[in-house]
């Protein structure tokens, strides 16, 4: 399977709420000998390999932020540490995998990735990523509601293949 | 501080089953984001990942392995096992228990490892 | 499986030295690569993970790099206490390690 990332670059004022998406594409198995382990964190956008280095969103590390799940499941961190920060990752049946952030500031600006491990018991398991940059507008300048630019197909860090 | 411990015979006679148990202190093996894993190290030679569980119990095995290894666990007693049948002399090395982060990937927690001698 | 080729095999420096071992995967591992370290009659310890990620507590003369199928842990400057055994091992799939790289002082 592979994850794709819909949009590329989110454009939001201060203040705004944003739901960053990842999705997984291709064949993705949903019985019930299949485990998802996902999760989000901010990275740098490096010179050879983006989301290398794992840095936290709003203090909580990828850990505290993973969602896992049968592959017939939904998910969402329900957990009160994520929502004190104004954080919560959900993930659907379709495949959808996202992060809501509540109350954009300034300093939330910056790279953001998806992590997605799927656990095939008895067989095997395969790891892949996805990058999207989240900048963070105030004043004049800054559109009224976030303005979301989508991933071109060629974009090859934004798509990773198992 | 989680701590792993292994135990077991350090003898085992040619073409018997070897029997290993990983005991699993300062932290749960019910955790939901762990592999629990065993790896091996001839004298001398590299390492060679033989298996892992999921607290679940499901497992995956090393494929020139599979034929001859279980990992059972049991999360009463916070322990999993190695069992290894038909042993011959190059099954002879040091075992590890592991624990491996399923989000970070690698193995970051080790136990010190006991050496097994197959040998009649 | 994915096949894991380390080199050197093994190395003898002095002391301030820049060591720099590679190791090379059999197929695209994106950057699931992780650098122990084995001291004689001790368990691996886990150094670097995501090929350039340093785990809680290393020194920072330890670092690693690469992507794809090619990649370089660097010991900056040697220290007496940094003579051991080098492992790389990949997680994109099932777990695989290279064959280590021994690293002595001259």
């Known amino acids: 399977f592979k994850v794709a990332t819909p949009y590329s670059l989110y454009v939001c004022p201060e203040g705004q709420n944003v739901t960053l998406t990842c999705r997984l594409l291709g064949p993705v198995d949903k019985g019930h000998d299949v485990t998802f382990y996902k999760t989000w964190y901010r990275s740098s956008r490096g010179e050879v390999q983006t989301c290398s280095e794992r840095r936290p969103i709003r203090n909580l590390t990828f850990q505290d932020l993973h969602l896992h799940h049968g592959g017939h499941q939904a998910a969402n961190t329900s957990h009160d540490l994520a929502q004190r920060h104004g954080l919560e990752s959900a993930s659907d049946h379709h495949g959808n995998f996202s992060i809501t952030m509540r109350n954009l500031t300034l300093l939330d600006s910056g790279l953001y990735c998806c992590l997605v491990v799927e656990i095939r018991h008895h067989h095997s398991e395969h790891r892949v990523h996805g990058a999207m940059e989240l900048q963070v507008q105030t004043g004049k300048d800054a559109p009224s509601n976030c303005v979301v630019y989508p991933s071109s197909s060629q974009d090859s860090e934004n798509i990773t293949a198992a | 501080q989680l701590q792993l411990q292994e135990s077991g015979p350090g003898l085992v006679k040619p073409s018997e089953t070897l029997s290993l148990t990983c005991i699993v202190s300062?932290?749960?093996?019910?955790?939901?984001?762990?592999?629990w894993g065993w790896i091996r190290q001839p004298p001398g030679k590299g390492l060679e990942w033989i298996g892992s569980?999921?607290?679940?119990?499901?497992?995956h095995y090393n494929p020139s392995l599979k034929s001859r290894v279980t990992i059972p666990v049991d999360t009463s007693k916070n322990q999993f096992s190695l069992k290894l049948s038909s042993v011959t002399a190059a099954d002879s090395a040091v075992y590890y228990c592991?624990?491996?982060?399923?989000?970070?990937?690698?193995?970051?927690?080790w136990g010190q490892g006991t050496l097994v001698t197959v040998s009649s | 499986d994915i096949q894991m080729t380390q080199s050197p095999s093994s190395l003898s420096a002095s002391v301030g030295d820049r060591v720099t071992i590679t190791c090379q995967a059999s197929q695209d591992i994106t950057n699931y690569l992780t650098w122990y370290q084995q001291k004689p009659g001790n368990a691996p310890k886990l150094l670097i993970y995501d090929a350039s990620n340093l785990h809680t507590g290393v020194p920072s003369r330890f670092s690693g790099s690469g992507s794809g199928t090619d990649f370089t842990f660097t010991i900056n400057s040697l220290q007496p206490e940094d003579v051991a055994t080098y492992f790389c091992?990949?997680?994109?799939?099932?777990?695989?390690f290279g064959g280590g790289t021994k690293v002595e002082i001259k």
């Open positions: 569980i999921f607290y679940s119990g499901n497992t």
């Open positions: 592991a624990r491996r982060d399923i989000l970070t990937g690698p193995f970051d927690y």
């Open positions: 091992q990949q997680y994109d799939n099932l777990p695989t």
């Open positions: 300062g932290g749960s093996i019910s955790s939901s984001g762990y592999y």
